[in-house]
């Protein structure tokens, strides 16, 4: 028998420095977790102790903190090279800065193979990107070879900016011929490494003949066997075992997100490359693991540029940006409008001639807006200003909801109106009218939404049975501020871009902003 140790990360999202337990900015260092310096310590410890070790990443290194905003992927290549990753799969967020923003900082600089079998380049891009990412790679490990085949969410064109010259094929259809090719090369140990979410990971394990292990990402799935070491609740055991259609037991793993854990899977293969056994658990990268001093010194060196960036002007406002709780928790506020407009703008994707855009709606809990910005400081808006408005380091995500769920969400928005609570919703692409004289749960008297399947966008009444795409904070998608109906009833959830980054990009693009209060939210009683 031959034993392989797979170390894996996914959805690191720019968390190069250690973070707090909830993956936001580290405040109390003695309680902080993750970060590449700590990850390196643990990886090196395992490499020294065990003979056959692979370090893999299942995508979405890009996007999530000021590190990505400033360094645009160069930081990913540099520190993944320093940690000596063996392979990476492309995630949807690797396309956030377009194909050029993937090629230049990452594909050209990575000292490890970057993989995806279901992304096919066409047109002028085909030759430009040829060889820079691969469908699979055969890696020597000890005296054996292991095939790694990559895959990426086929929803990427709706979630990021891959352009028109990349075709995202069905994962299973694309993977099978590449796995077959590896078999003809006498590679009998094959890992599928990819970024399509846990449900697709399980399908790949079930349907793709010849795949021995699936290492996934995208859904931030936490798997654990035994008592979990932190706040994350396991979605199943680690590894999650899927019985394939041809009767094999295929381990499927994922390691939550944000570099908080290092996935650790030990696989035993027989001489024919069949999996005999698999066991392991994610390792919590808490403060009991020291940060590697040389990587930490490198992080501190790269950090300097970030501190300079946060005080530079992004753009100007010529109006007061009212982000006060007195406004945003009670009525339409122009800071809410600005943020929602930025959220929609960040999700403009012309993927279908029938639609002017795939999504037109935004909702945002008023309690998530934490500060106003005064225009009397020469109108200057900096990253620092925006960090005061959006201090939680969240993301603006894409969900699919039924109209009935949205209606419930708007009822929840005003179910205890007047107590300055955070659930009051700010909106974009939505016109809502409340009647507060009615009883809670029946206060929404009008709810019109902006059409997407139209050449001239206009507002139509919400249909209860229709499925709508909505951009909202991850906090709401996860049921925060009491929006349990969103969490329970959402039909799809894809994590998006860092909140501050979305707004800062929009302000930089617009240069001068002047958001107004324009009647998106109205009250039909005389007292408002």
């Amino acid at each position: 028998a031959w034993e392989l140790t797979i170390l894996h990360t996914n959805d690191v999202h720019s968390r190069l420095e250690q973070t707090s337990e909830d993956s936001s900015k580290c405040v109390n260092a003695s309680r902080c977790m993750g970060g590449v310096a700590r990850l390196f310590t643990k990886v090196q410890q395992i490499r020294r102790a065990e003979p056959n070790v692979l370090l893999l990443d299942a995508g979405d290194q890009y996007q999530g903190t000021i590190w990505f905003t400033v360094y645009k992927g160069a930081e990913v290549a540099h520190f993944m090279n320093a940690l000596r990753y063996d392979a990476m799969a492309l995630g949807n967020h690797e396309f956030d800065n377009g194909v050029e923003g993937l090629i230049e900082p990452l594909l050209k600089e990575a000292k490890f193979p970057i993989l995806s079998a279901n992304i096919k380049a066409k047109g002028p891009l085909a030759s430009q990107i040829s060889g820079l990412y691969l469908p699979y790679k055969v890696l020597p490990v000890g005296d054996e070879v292991v095939g790694i085949v990559g895959y990426t969410s086929k929803e990427t064109p709706f979630l990021s900016n891959p352009g028109t010259n990349l075709v995202f094929e069905d994962e299973i259809t694309a993977l099978q011929p590449e796995v077959d090719k590896l078999k003809t090369l006498n590679v009998n140990k094959i890992i599928a490494l990819g970024h399509s979410g846990f449900e697709m990971d399980k399908l790949i394990a079930q349907k793709v003949r010849g795949v021995d292990v699936v290492v996934g990402g995208h859904s931030n799935t936490f798997l654990y066997t035994g008592n979990p070491p932190s706040k994350e609740v396991p979605a199943g055991k680690y590894p999650f075992i899927v019985t394939s259609d041809d009767g094999r037991k295929v381990p499927v793993v994922q390691a939550y997100a944000f570099g908080k854990y290092l996935g650790y899977l030990k696989i035993e293969f027989d001489e024919r490359g069949n999996v005999i056994s698999s066991h392991g658990n994610p390792i919590l990268l808490n403060s009991s693991i020291p940060e590697d001093p040389s990587i930490k010194a490198d992080i501190n060196k790269w950090r300097i540029k970030l501190d300079n960036y946060s005080t530079q002007e992004l753009g100007k406002t010529i109006v007061y940006l009212d982000g006060s709780s007195q406004s945003c928790r009670f009525r339409e506020c122009n800071m809410g409008n600005l943020i929602c407009d930025a959220m929609i703008n960040n999700n403009l994707r012309h993927t279908d001639e029938m639609f002017w855009n795939h999504v037109s709606m935004c909702i945002l809990n008023g309690g998530g807006i934490r500060s106003p910005i005064d225009e009397r400081n020469n109108g200057t808006i900096t990253w620092e200003n925006l960090a005061a408005v959006l201090p939680f380091g969240g993301t603006f995500d894409l969900v699919q909801l039924k109209g009935s769920t949205l209606k419930k969400a708007f009822e929840h928005s005003v179910h205890r109106y007047g107590q300055s609570t955070g659930e009051f919703l700010q909106v974009g692409g939505i016109h809502v009218v409340y009647d507060l004289s009615r009883k809670p749960g029946d206060r929404v008297v009008k709810l019109d939404v902006l059409c997407t399947k139209c050449r001239v966008p206009s507002y139509d009444p919400l249909k209860m049975d229709e499925v709508y795409k909505v951009i909202l904070p991850n906090f709401l998608a996860n049921g925060g501020d009491g929006f349990q109906m969103i969490k329970d009833e959402l039909l799809r959830h894809d994590s998006g871009d860092q909140d501050i980054n979305v707004v800062s990009t929009y302000i930089s693009k617009m240069k001068v902003i002047y958001p107004a209060v324009e009647g998106r939210i109205k009250f039909s009683t005389g007292s408002h």
């Epitope: 090629i103 230049e104 050209k108 600089e109 000292k111 490890f112 030759s127 990107i129 040829s130 060889g131």
Partner: antibody, heavy 117, light 107 residues
Amino acid sequence: QVQLVQSGAEVKKPGASVKVSCKASGYTFTSYWMHWVRQAPGQRLEWIGNINPSNGGTKYNEKFKSRVTITVDKSASTAYLELSSLRSEDTAVYYCARRDYGSPSYWGQGTTVTVSS
Amino acid sequence: DIQMTQSPSSLSASVGDRVTITCRASQDINSYLTWFQQKPGKAPKSLIYRTNILLDGVPSRFSGSGSGTDFTLTISSLQPEDFATYYCLQYHEFPVTFGGGTKLEIK
């Protein structure tokens, strides 16, 4: 297949400059960095610098920084190495090499530069 | 700069022999080491990058191992076309630096 074809041998006087070319074919020129390396008689190989053909970004060995310029002509899929203020110790074979995964991987056939008065 | 020390500087062997060449770095270079072959008057030919990954078309009798500061190139069964000079280079950090070479001659 990947091919790097370098210009012919050069004989130069001390103090002069030399410009060596490296024409790439068999791949998209702008997609890979290009290294330049030299090998002087009886000496170990020396890395001179490299260039990103898509944007002209360069990295140079400090030893050569004041005298070397690496450029590209994207339309001709050609990289150039220019070395000025030549001295006898610059007599060497100069190689271009395509960079893959950070490392020089595919090499040109070399250009002999002789510096002699 | 990182110094690369190769040994031996020359080596005599016969067809079919197993040969090992070593390369030592003056500091940790992770696994970022390439081996290449050069024959007189010819362009260098890279064989292995990142310590142990063979470039396309390189025969499987060539293999590499090591990490940190100590690395080896092994040719499992020498063929007539393998007699040449072998070099290592590190690309962990700039400037890229080279070993002094090992000349492999027919015994």
